[in-house]
């Protein structure tokens, strides 16, 4: 069927349109275009004879039309009058005619709109504003945008006049926004420039900052006032009702108690004619004295004396505060506060109670701190330590022993050998020792202030022969793939070589094995169950050698994925089901069973006599090792078939 398509259907003035012909018949003589919905010679635009390829203008030809051999008609420089229907008359060779009608519409290109307003300075909560989109244009649609968003739904917003007018009732400061209007028709859309609505509002109740109302004598008072307002507010200050100044800030240096009173800020908006005030009450306090601490015992003895610290001066109706090591007081039965908190008593002082201690007096504004006080706690001497830790020495070397004991004041030292006093020094030195220098070496530490003494005895053996060593371990039960173990060969001896064996073999090369501390320490990183072996250490010098007893490492591991045996999964009805679960684990795992998810027993073996098809299902064995914190499980499906119906196994 012959049809006409307009491309485009909506045409802008000045542009062009193509009336495109579809399904043109074969064997044509010619065709004619007419303005309107029917063939009318008076309204012929153009005719076309195919044989001669001759186009002949008609009465309605405007000079802007071009006809194409395929019968399509191009109209250029479109004007408003071109809107309407166009009819194509086709004359076939057999002189049978066909007609088709198409149409298009012509619209003007819209100008850029602008917004007019009936009120350039509306007052908040009082005025309404009507925005109108100019110019008024026929067949145009009007749209509005607020801050580049489409209009919000609000009972205070109303569109009228075919959406050309936007009215804001009872404007608020939040209506201060960018407004745009847009005109649209089928061929164009244009947006106006922004119009910013300037809403007059305020002043709101002013806020005075800072918020604190308590000040200390001698400080500066600096108050600032702010009230939301458009245009910005004008400010005035009043003190106790008396006008001071017309500024936003009020500054009074070096205030005294006499500056206490009520401070009023007044905000005024000349455009709205409104005033608002806020009052704050300022209190100025006299400066309190700086506190200090007195002590009833300046040199207390550890674990014997108590110390009472008192915060001075005594002031009525005052709160006293205490700090130790810049922290508030810890909860301790050895710390006691008096009823008024002014005295802090330390019962049975220790060396850790040195402080520093601070007390504070709290007034309405702040806390005044005392200078810190440090206690001189007399303590010790503790048990002295003798270094180095060697106990075996070879003849001919020098023996140099040093003694140290924690003590305040520092300890005085004495050395005794086999009970006989030697010297009053911290270090003992004997050159070129022999077997005769073997014996008991005693260091005595004395604190002259507390009168306490402590001793440590060390057995020194001077011998070419080495003792039998022993192995100490930092972890007797390491967890597999998690822990490390450090074995140390004892004792520490001078000029000695340390050796290690595992299961009677020298140490294997492994990145998990590390020797340190002069080979005296053997560390196993990330232990595995295979490390549960016999470890032996040996010591040797140029004269002798000796080996320790073996130490076996107890590695905690597992549980590994359990195995259920027998492996059969098919049983005949009437057979006994006897399932055994096993998982490698140290310590042995706790076993438990579930049948079809229901907990059963906590045994390694699950036995069910004379099973039936009702015993079909999933049999799960769960294993747990609390020492490693690990769990594991396995599920087995069991099928029980009626006797004689299955090639399955019978248990």
């Amino acid at each position: 069927k012959l049809t006409i398509e307009s491309t485009p259907f909506n045409v802008a003035e000045g542009k062009e349109v193509l009336l495109l012909v579809h399904n043109l018949p074969q064997h044509l003589f010619g065709y004619s275009w007419y303005k309107g919905e029917r063939v009318d010679g008076n309204r012929q635009i153009i005719g076309y004879v195919i044989g001669t390829q001759q186009a002949t203008p008609g009465p309605a030809y405007s000079g802007r039309e071009i006809i194409y051999p395929n019968a399509s008609l191009l109209i250029q420089n479109i004007i408003q009058n071109d809107t309407g229907f166009y009819t194509l008359h086709v004359i076939k060779s057999d002189l049978v005619n066909e007609e088709a009608t198409g149409q298009f519409r012509v619209y003007p290109e819209l100008p850029k709109p602008s917004i007019s307003s009936n009120n350039s300075k509306p007052v908040e909560d009082k005025d309404a504003v009507a925005f109108t989109c100019e110019p008024e244009t026929q067949d145009a649609t009007y749209l509005w945008w607020v801050n580049n968003q489409s209009l919000p739904v609000s009972p205070r917003l109303q569109l009228s006049n075919g959406n050309r007018t936007l009215t804001l009732f009872n404007v608020t400061r939040n209506d201060t926004a960018s407004y745009k209007c847009e005109t649209q028709n089928p061929v164009s859309a244009r947006r106006s420039d922004s119009v910013i609505l300037n809403v007059l509002y305020g002043p709101d109740a002013p806020t005075i900052s800072p918020l604190n109302t308590s000040y200390r004598s001698g400080e500066n008072l600096n108050l600032s006032c702010h009230a939301a307002s458009n245009p910005p507010a004008q400010y005035s200050w009043f003190v106790n009702g008396t006008f001071q100044q017309s500024t936003q800030e009020l500054f009074i240096p070096n205030i005294t108690v006499n500056n206490s009173g009520s401070y009023t800020c007044q905000a005024h908006n000349s455009d709205t004619g409104l005033n608002r005030t806020t009052v704050t009450t300022i209190t100025v306090y006299a400066e309190p004295p700086k506190p200090f601490i007195t002590s009833n015992n300046s040199n207390p003895v550890e674990d014997e004396d108590a110390v009472a610290l008192t915060c001075e001066p005594e002031i009525q109706n005052t709160t006293y505060l205490w700090w130790v090591n810049n922290q508030s007081l810890p909860v301790s039965p050895r710390l006691q506060l008096s009823n008024d908190n002014r005295t802090l008593t330390l019962l049975s002082v220790t060396r850790n109670d040195v402080g520093p201690y601070e007390c504070g007096i709290q007034n309405e504004l702040s806390v005044d701190h005392s200078d810190p006080v440090i206690l001189n706690v007399l303590y010790g001497p503790d048990d002295p330590t003798i270094s180095p830790s060697y106990t075996y020495y070879r003849p001919g070397v020098n023996l140099s022993l040093s003694c140290h004991a924690a003590s305040n004041p520092p300890a005085q030292y004495s050395w005794l050998i086999d009970g006989n006093i030697q010297q009053h020094t911290q270090e003992l030195f004997i050159s070129n020792i022999t077997e005769k220098n073997s014996g008991l070496y005693t260091c005595q530490a004395n604190n002259s202030a507390s009168g306490h003494s402590r001793t440590t005895v060390k057995t020194i053996t001077v011998s070419a022969e080495l003792p039998k060593p022993s192995i100490s371990s930092n972890n007797s039960k390491p967890v597999e793939d998690k822990d490390a173990v450090a074995f140390t060969c004892e004792p520490e001896a001078q000029n000695t070589t340390y050796l290690w064996w595992v299961n009677g073999q020298s140490l294997p090369v492994s990145p998990r094995l590390q020797l340190s501390n002069g080979n005296r320490t053997l560390t196993l990183f990330n232990v595995t169950r295979n490390d549960a072996r016999a470890y032996v250490c040996g010591i040797q010098n140029s004269v002798s050698a000796n080996r320790s007893d073996p130490v076996t490492l107890d590695v905690l591991y597992g549980p590994d994925t359990p195995i259920i045996s027998p492996p059969d999964s098919s049983y005949l009805s009437g057979a006994n089901l006897n399932l055994s679960c096993h998982s490698a684990s140290n310590p042995s795992p706790q076993y438990s069973w579930r049948i079809n998810g229901i907990p059963q027993q906590h045994t390694q073996v699950l036995f069910i006599a004379k099973i039936t098809p009702n015993n079909n299902g999933t049999y799960a064995c769960f294993v747990s090792n609390l020492a490693t914190g690990r769990n594991n499980s396995i599920v087995k499906s069991i099928t029980v078939s009626a006797s004689g119906t299955s090639p399955g196994l019978s248990a």
Partner: antibody
Framework: QVQLVQSGAEVKKPGASVKVSCKAS????????LHWVRQAPGQGLEWIGY????????NYSQKFQGRVTMTRDTSTSTVYMELSSLRSEDTAVYYC?????????????WGQGTLVTVSS | DIQMTQSPSSLSASVGDRVTITCRAS??????LAWYQQKPGKVPKLLIY???NLVEGVPSRFSGSGSGTDFTLTISSLQPEDVATYYC?????????FGQGTKVEIK
């Protein structure tokens, strides 16, 4: 239901032996391990050892090693605990108790106890 | 052998009170700890195993906690029927050892 029924009270002279029985019922005898625990008058609980009924394996406390023997009879689901060389401090109530499972579990069912009095 | 130390050895509390008994092992027993209740003239009854697992049928006012060496049995609201001696026991390998017991009475 699970039950452990022990033999009756015994009075023995110092140096003698005593054999206490514990008959199990209400569960599969060979699946659970059985322990012996004693309690002297007014005192706490003291573990003696255990037996695994399926294999007859025993594990005794070092304190009773050499004096205690635990056996089992699977045909009657009974375990026995024999203590020899009795002395007065062996006077106690002797309990058999079933382990809640196998390996590192506590004791969930206890016999009613057997009072053994050692007196000259 | 692993030693088990219970505290207190006895306590007296009112009905409805929260009661706590502690048990300390001489070495790490991980979570292998059980609590028993023994009423006068009766056999011990298992309450809790693996430090915190409540045995079926035991009232929920009983609870256990802890791991390593320090463990606690808590009775959230003491009832008259809870008068008994309570024992802790480690079940980490043999020999099994028990605490010396805590006697709980009603005020």
């Amino acid at each position: 239901q699970v039950q452990l029924v022990q033999s009756g009270a015994e009075v023995k002279k110092p140096g003698a032996s005593v054999k206490v029985s514990c008959k199990a019922s209400g569960y599969i005898f060979t699946s659970y391990w059985l322990h012996w625990v004693r309690q002297a008058p007014g005192q706490g609980l003291e573990w003696i050892g255990y037996i695994t009924p399926n294999t007859g394996y025993t594990n005794y406390s070092q304190k009773f090693q050499g004096r205690v023997t635990m056996t089992r009879d699977t045909s009657t689901s009974t375990v026995y605990m024999e203590l020899s060389s009795l002395r007065s401090e062996d006077t106690a109530v002797y309990y058999c108790a079933r382990e809640y499972g196998n390996y590192n579990y506590p004791l969930d069912y206890w016999g009613q106890g057997t009072l053994v009095t050692v007196s000259s | 052998d692993i030693q088990m130390t219970q505290s207190p050895s006895s306590l007296s509390a009112s009905v409805g009170d929260r009661v706590t008994i502690t048990c300390r092992a001489s070495e790490n027993i991980y979570g292998y700890l059980a609590w028993y209740q023994q009423k006068p003239g009766k056999v011990p009854k298992l309450l809790i195993y693996n430090a915190k697992n409540l045995v079926e049928g035991v009232p929920s006012r009983f609870s256990g906690s802890g791991s390593g060496t320090d463990f606690t049995l808590t009775i959230s609201s003491l009832q008259p029927e809870d008068v008994a001696t309570y024992y802790c026991q480690h079940h980490y390998g043999t020999p099994y050892t028990f605490g010396q017991g805590t006697k709980v009475e009603i005020k």
